[in-house]
Interface confidence: low
């Protein structure tokens, strides 16, 4: 439905508030590095225009679009050339090119400096005084360092931030109620981040039909109830919704997910016997919750799969007819029988039917050639099941941070050229599946590990895209996106590989240590193990944990010494001298 | 992508006839069986009736039996409900879905029975 001015369309569909927050998001999204204060006074300056459209909607300039809108205002700020680089040359091209432009520079990795959390009190005080700048804030600082983060969730973030500090700075003790509110919420927003990140890089580097078949794949085993062109439609929706978000049309992307959300609400019967909790809140709410709902139970009555699609003489003309809606009915019906598998591994059972399907069919005996087609899927289903096995074996084993420090040193001799804080961070994130997953019983550990471990892989894929080092991390990440896990652990040690240079600097370590979180420690000391790695990657798993067990006593013993620099300077040469003879550095 | 297209709805009076088409398109129409259902005001949906791919199989609720025939013009990816002995609690949003569900994958047309 075509609007003379889709800015005034959007204000009133979305209200003044939400309006505002969005646009404020999608400015930080795009211009990383611009101080809070910048972008609120053009987010004000829009929101001024906004409002003169809804007044008049023939106005001047109220039929342009929003990227012309949003381009030209970007564009007026005075140190993009200083501040931003290459990227000012956006602002020399046209729209659709120039939106295009702003979104190829978008930054997984800015240089921004870590955020700090403030002392309780100085938080509550600066809430109380200020109570929108405080909220504007949070949304600045999350968008600049996310910039693919999901704009209408981070409104219910922004939410939940606001219930917290609202309920916490009146209590007794502030801290108690508000520190573990705020870790929740970093967490989860982080996790809501990575996760976003993967369905915009499936959109962006595999296309439309991959994420379509991500989406028919994880609805079907969410809503087994629904018919498929129930879940069709729901698709569809999705997509649009999704596409709109990682392109930067974030207002209309909010528009539309608060639609599918009325319209999920409305047909409930038709698609979930779950939804009722989630369709009796708020808009923020319901969104959000609509999104985690736990999977409907499977309708009792499913017949087997080979009827339709290996025993029916109709296959190969079926197929024919409409490939993709075929393929897509195979993979309703394969998802919703299968709430124990992991999307990728229903993506990947898909498209063996396809390559079968399409050999088949143009075989002499297309029957007699597909007839086995589902004892190809055998061997598929056992890799992760039995990957899995094995690694919750070893986290149970080992615990989180020693899982994590395996985990380091498998990646660091796969891919030894990616940045040591990336292979920190990615590994970090790979040993959280342990305790994410690992405590779920069997029919929910594939899909618990295995779409995340997707969803770490594409945090390495997005970081090393940025400043490409291994040709082995290029090809696992571009050339498959649902095997990208199998070919990341099909990755043995490389051997082409030249060891890093010793640099005792890299080694040395002083007494801030001491005052670090425990977390912070951890990863001092995985950087210690990466860079050890590095430097030596035939090292064995014993002489390794014998040089980390050192480590570990040498920082605890010089954290209890009365002169901890000293300790430090002193017993940190000798570790030095330990350990390069240990290693045979 | 799946497009169910309904139409042939109205006003009619009580007593008359309507005959509903629905068009599909973007899935191979032959090979799936094909529901009618319907929506009255304030109400959740019904189903109405339903045929298998090839045409020879038909079923009808009790309501609509012995009045409504559904059929389907596989060569026209088509299928049709004609309406007999309307009444007036046959006033729906009528719309087909896929298989044999309540589900709404499309918008419907508005069929009034009303004097």
């Known amino acids: 439905d075509a609007h003379k001015s889709e800015v005034a369309h959007r204000f009133k569909d979305l209200g003044e508030e939400n309006f505002k927050a969005l646009v404020l998001i999608a400015f930080a999204q795009y211009l990383q590095q611009c101080p809070f204060e910048d972008h609120v006074k053009l987010v004000n300056e829009v929101t001024e225009f906004a409002k003169t459209c809804v007044a008049d909607e023939s106005a001047e300039n109220c039929d342009k679009s929003l990227h012309t809108l949003f381009g030209d205002k970007l564009c007026t700020v005075a140190t993009l050339r200083e501040t931003y680089g290459e990227m000012a040359d956006c602002c020399a091209k046209q729209e659709p090119e120039r939106n295009e432009c702003f979104l190829q520079h978008k930054d997984d990795n800015p240089n921004l400096p870590r955020l700090v959390r403030p002392e309780v009190d100085v938080m509550c005080t600066a809430f109380h005084d200020n109570e929108e700048t405080f909220l504007k804030k949070y949304l600045y600082e999350i968008a600049r360092r996310h910039p693919y983060f999901y704009a209408p969730e981070l409104l219910f973030f922004a939410k939940r931030y606001k219930a917290a500090f609202t309920e916490c700075c009146q209590a007794a003790d502030k801290a108690a109620c508000l520190l573990p509110k705020l870790d929740e919420l970093r967490d989860e927003g982080k996790a809501s981040s990575a996760k976003q990140r993967l369905k915009c890089a499936s959109l962006q580097k595999f296309g439309e039909r991959a994420f379509k078949a991500w989406a028919v794949a994880r609805l079907s085993q969410r809503f087994p109830k629904a018919e498929f062109a129930e879940v069709s439609k729901l698709v569809t929706d999705l997509t649009k919704v999704h596409t709109e978000c990682c392109h930067g049309d974030l207002l209309e992307c909010a528009d539309d997910r608060a639609d599918l959300a009325k319209y999920i609400c409305e047909n409930q019967d038709s698609i979930s016997s779950k939804l009722k909790e989630c369709c009796e809140k708020p808009l923020l709410e319901k969104s959000h919750c609509i999104a985690e709902v736990e999977n409907d139970e499977m309708p009792a009555d499913l017949p087997s799969l080979a009827a339709d699609f290996v025993e029916s003489k109709d296959v190969c003309k079926n197929y024919a007819e409409a490939k993709d809606v075929f393929l897509g009915m195979f993979l309703y019906e394969y998802a919703r029988r299968h709430p124990d598998y992991s999307v990728v591994l229903l993506l990947r059972l898909a498209k063996t039917y396809e390559t079968t399907l399409e050999k088949c069919c143009a075989a002499a005996d297309p029957h007699e050639c597909y007839a086995k087609v589902f004892d190809e899927f055998k061997p598929l289903v056992e890799e992760p099941q039995n990957l899995i096995k094995q690694n919750c074996e070893l986290f149970e084993q080992l615990g989180e941070y020693k899982f994590q420090n395996a985990l380091l040193v498998r990646y660091t001799k796969k891919v030894p050229q990616v940045s040591t804080p990336t292979l920190v961070e990615v590994s970090r994130n790979l040993g959280k599946v342990g305790s994410k997953c690992c405590k779920h019983p069997e029919a929910k550990r594939m899909p618990c590990a295995e779409d995340y471990l997707s969803v770490v892989l594409n945090q390495l894929c997005v970081l090393h895209e940025k400043t490409p080092v291994s040709d082995r991390v290029t090809k696992c990440c571009t050339e498959s996106l649902v095997n990208r896990r199998p070919c990341f652990s099909a990755l043995e040690v490389d051997e082409t590989y030249v060891p890093k240079e010793f640099n005792a600097e890299t080694f040395t370590f002083h007494a801030d240590i001491c005052t670090l979180s425990e977390k912070e420690r951890q990863i001092k000391k995985q950087t210690a193990l990466v860079e050890l790695v590095k430097h030596k990657p035939k090292a064995t798993k014993e002489q390794l944990k014998a040089v980390m067990d050192d480590f570990a006593a040498f920082v605890e013993k010089c954290c209890k010494a009365d002169d901890k620099e000293t300790c430090f300077a002193e017993e940190g040469k000798k570790l030095v001298a330990a350990s390069q003879a240990a290693l045979g550095l | 992508e799946v497009q169910l297209l309904e139409s042939g709805g109205g006003l009619v009076q009580p007593g008359g006839s309507l005959r509903l088409s629905c068009a599909a398109s973007?899935?191979?129409?032959?090979?799936?069986?094909m529901s009618w259902v319907r929506q009255a005001p304030g109400k959740g949906p019904e189903w109405v009736s339903a045929?298998?791919?090839?045409?020879?199989?038909?079923r009808y609720a009790e309501t609509v039996k012995g009045r409504f025939t559904i059929s389907r013009d596989n060569s026209k990816n088509t299928l049709y409900l004609q309406m007999n002995s309307l009444r007036p609690e046959d006033t729906a949003v009528y719309y087909c879905?896929?298989?044999?569900?309540?589900?709404?994958g499309s918008q419907g047309t508005l069929v009034t029975v009303s004097s």
């Open positions: 973007g899935f191979s129409f032959g090979s799936f069986g």
């Open positions: 045929i298998d791919s090839g045409g020879a199989d038909t």
């Open positions: 879905t896929i298989g044999r569900s309540t589900s709404r």
